[in-house]
């Protein structure tokens, strides 16, 4: 089938990095500057992606592969192939219609991207707050209040007593 196809279609012989030039009797011509073809048999070359503004070049365009972009410092990629750059915020903030804003009380964000999320509600799991939450950190839940009351049996069994002279493993 491949041999038959190449007899019928001379363009199938054009390798990546070239295009089948109809204006030149279907000769394989190299892709012009700032364009590429990543597969053989192409009748046109694709325009190279340009990384501009907040986008910076991670990989230069070649005759056989497109350029790849990432974001300048202070921004991070969103979408497939870094199709968007979004401004970073500080931990404890989120990006709003007014730019970066501190998380409201009761919420936190431990990253430079994304939204502020509510603190964990320890009481829903029957636990108490061991460490208070901040704008940057979630609360840390500890044992349930009942576990902390005097005389209550501990959920975790006590560690076995060590014999004198034995060091722990």
């Amino acid at each position: 089938f491949e041999r038959t196809r190449s007899l019928q279609d001379p363009c199938s012989n054009c390798p990546a990095g070239t295009f089948c030039d109809n204006n030149r009797n279907q000769i394989c011509s190299p892709c012009p500057p700032n364009s590429f073809s990543s597969a053989g048999g192409q009748r046109t070359c694709d325009i190279c992606r340009q990384c501009k503004g907040v986008f910076r070049t991670r990989k230069e365009c070649s005759s056989t592969s497109n350029a790849e972009c990432d974001c300048t410092p202070g921004f991070h990629c969103l979408g497939a192939g870094c199709s968007m750059c979004e401004q970073d915020c500080k931990q404890g903030q989120e990006l709003t219609k007014k730019g970066c804003k501190d998380c409201c009380f009761g919420t936190f964000n431990d990253q430079k991207r994304g939204i502020c999320r509510p603190w964990t509600n320890c009481s829903l799991d029957g636990k108490s707050v061991l460490v208070n939450g901040t704008k940057e950190r979630d609360v840390v839940c500890g044992p349930s209040p009942a576990d902390l009351s005097p005389g209550a049996s501990s959920v975790t069994p006590p560690a076995p007593a060590r014999e004198p002279g034995h060091s722990p493993q």
Epitope: K52, C69, S83, M84, Q87, K97, G99
Partner: nanobody, 122 residues
């Protein structure tokens, strides 16, 4: 071919004013959201302001009340009126299309101008 050309930058004293212009060509300006960004010396880019095709405007907190973005669709131009300028406003200011229409977000298909320098100093 798409072209964005900024002008109006310069040296101004603290408290002074400047009006930046961005002349656009090569695309349907009236249907495009537009934005201004800036890059201070040794710092990263910062989203400053944006305007939707319908005229809704958005600003980063640090310039709200001092800067005003506007557009003239008949002239294919977007403006940034900057009043009460501060030394920390010193930066290269860039005009860009704003396909994402999200604060602080630009799309790979957005077009960017070459920038105009604004220096606020006494």
């Amino acid at each position: 071919e798409v072209d964005l050309v900024e002008s109006g930058g310069g040296l101004v004293q603290p408290g002074g004013s400047l009006r930046l212009s961005c002349a656009a060509s090569g695309f349907t300006f009236s249907r495009s959201a537009m934005s201004w960004a800036r890059q201070a010396p040794g710092k990263g880019f910062e989203w400053v302001s944006g305007i939707y095709s319908g005229g809704s405007t958005y600003y980063v907190d640090s310039v709200e009340g001092r800067f005003t973005i506007s557009r003239d669709n008949a002239k294919n131009t977007v403006y940034l009126q900057m009043n009460s300028l501060k030394p920390e406003d010193t930066a290269v200011y860039y005009c860009a299309t704003w396909g994402s229409q999200q604060i602080g977000v630009w799309h790979e298909d957005d077009y960017w101008g070459q920038g105009t320098q604004v220096t606020v100093s006494s």
